[in-house]
């Protein structure tokens, strides 16, 4: 999916309002410094691209991220702000509404959060020059 | 089966707003968007915007920001969208949407529309 | 906004007519195209969308091709109920917005 009609400022706002904090409640008790961020983005388009590809792709060691709160509430600011994304995303979206297994929080998956937080930031920053 | 039932007719004067609601019934409301489209009479269809109930996002077409309001009560399961400043161009029957797919913004349900009728 | 223009505005066609109806975007939208029949007095009912997925429960002779600019809605066999008005609709970019509908008469 192409990121580049996505209305940013509206998504941006919704992760400041509340995907932030809810990324925030998923890594309590983690030290900011525990990670290092080994993942970037060069713009907005680019950041949802691997927004997207973290949080909802399955990673060897986390299986569980799309079923977080702070995920759902990605997939529903990325529908409803960026035109026929949802469309692309059917049989995704579908099947992790339908899998409420139990939630295990690992070690790889803190990483993964740590790497989306992030990304988030990027996203949020796109005039800065990339480090 | 899904059904979106939504208010009856009303008479407005120019200036004055009018609030419309849609209730869902048959299935789950929160996770689905609802849109709002309108269509005057004898012409095409305009899509106004849209809500996630579940988290309260919402996207407004350009041309109707700032006078629309589209919201949502969970407890309900009904979607509500108020137009402000009518005019008589405002004049049209309004329809409230749904998808079966969770968040997509596709139309596959819709409600039996209501017309508003602006008029002094 | 991207601008949606069907052709014909209206025609006229006998039961059992093959029906073509086109669809012109302003800009490339890629596969981001729904078509919708409208009944009068009804609510419009989704018939295909993606440019070419046919919506459930609506009947195999609708189909629906093109990408890009260029979309086609087609009727292979027209039938007495299929007397209506067709839409298209993008959905590539915000706003969505339909073309202005084509009638379809019986002759």
């Known amino acids: 999916y192409d990121f580049t009609n996505c209305d940013f400022e509206k998504i941006k706002a919704a992760y400041l309002s509340t995907i932030s904090k809810d990324l925030i409640t998923y890594m309590s008790g983690t030290k900011s410094t525990e990670f290092n961020n080994t993942v970037s983005c060069s713009n907005r388009p680019h950041c949802l691209t691997e927004i997207q590809s973290l949080t909802f792709n399955p990673t060897a060691g986390c299986a569980s991220l799309a079923k977080e709160m702070f995920a759902m509430k990605t997939k529903a600011a990325l529908a409803i702000w960026c035109p026929g994304y949802s469309e692309t995303q059917i049989n995704a979206t579908q099947a992790m509404k339908k899998r409420r297994k139990r939630k295990v929080t690992t070690n790889k998956c803190l990483e993964q959060v740590s790497q989306l937080q992030g990304l988030w930031r990027r996203f949020n920053r796109p005039l800065l020059k990339q480090q | 089966q899904v059904q979106l039932v939504q208010s009856g007719a009303e008479v407005k004067k120019p200036g004055s707003s009018v609030k419309v609601s849609c209730k869902a019934s048959?299935?789950?409301?929160?996770?689905?968007?609802i849109s709002w489209v309108r269509q005057a009479p004898g012409q095409g269809l305009e899509w106004m915007g849209g809500i996630i109930p579940e988290f309260g996002f919402t996207n407004y077409a350009q041309k109707f920001q700032g006078r629309v309001t589209i919201t949502a009560d969970e407890s309900t399961s009904t979607a509500y969208m108020e137009l402000s400043s009518l005019r008589s161009e405002d004049t049209a029957v309004y329809y409230c949407?749904?998808?079966?797919?969770?968040?997509?913004?596709?139309?596959?349900?819709w409600g039996q529309g209501t017309l508003v009728t602006v008029s002094s | 906004d991207i601008q949606m223009t069907q052709s014909p505005s209206s025609l006229s066609a006998s039961v059992g007519d093959r029906v073509t109806i086109t669809c012109r975007a302003s800009?490339?939208?890629?596969?981001?195209l729904n078509w919708y029949q409208q009944k009068p007095g009804k609510a419009p009912k989704l018939l295909i969308y993606g440019a070419s997925s046919l919506q459930s429960g609506v009947p195999s002779r609708f189909s629906g091709s093109g990408s890009g600019t260029d979309f086609t809605l087609t009727i292979s066999s027209l039938q007495p109920e299929d007397f209506a008005v067709y839409y298209c609709?993008?959905?590539?970019?915000?706003?969505?917005?339909f073309g202005q509908g084509t009638k379809v008469e019986i002759k």
């Open positions: 949407a749904r998808s079966g797919m969770f968040y997509s913004i596709l139309f596959d349900y």
């Open positions: 609709q993008q959905q590539n970019d915000y706003p969505l917005t």
């Open positions: 800009q490339d939208i890629y596969n981001y």
């Open positions: 048959g299935g789950t409301f929160s996770s689905y968007a």
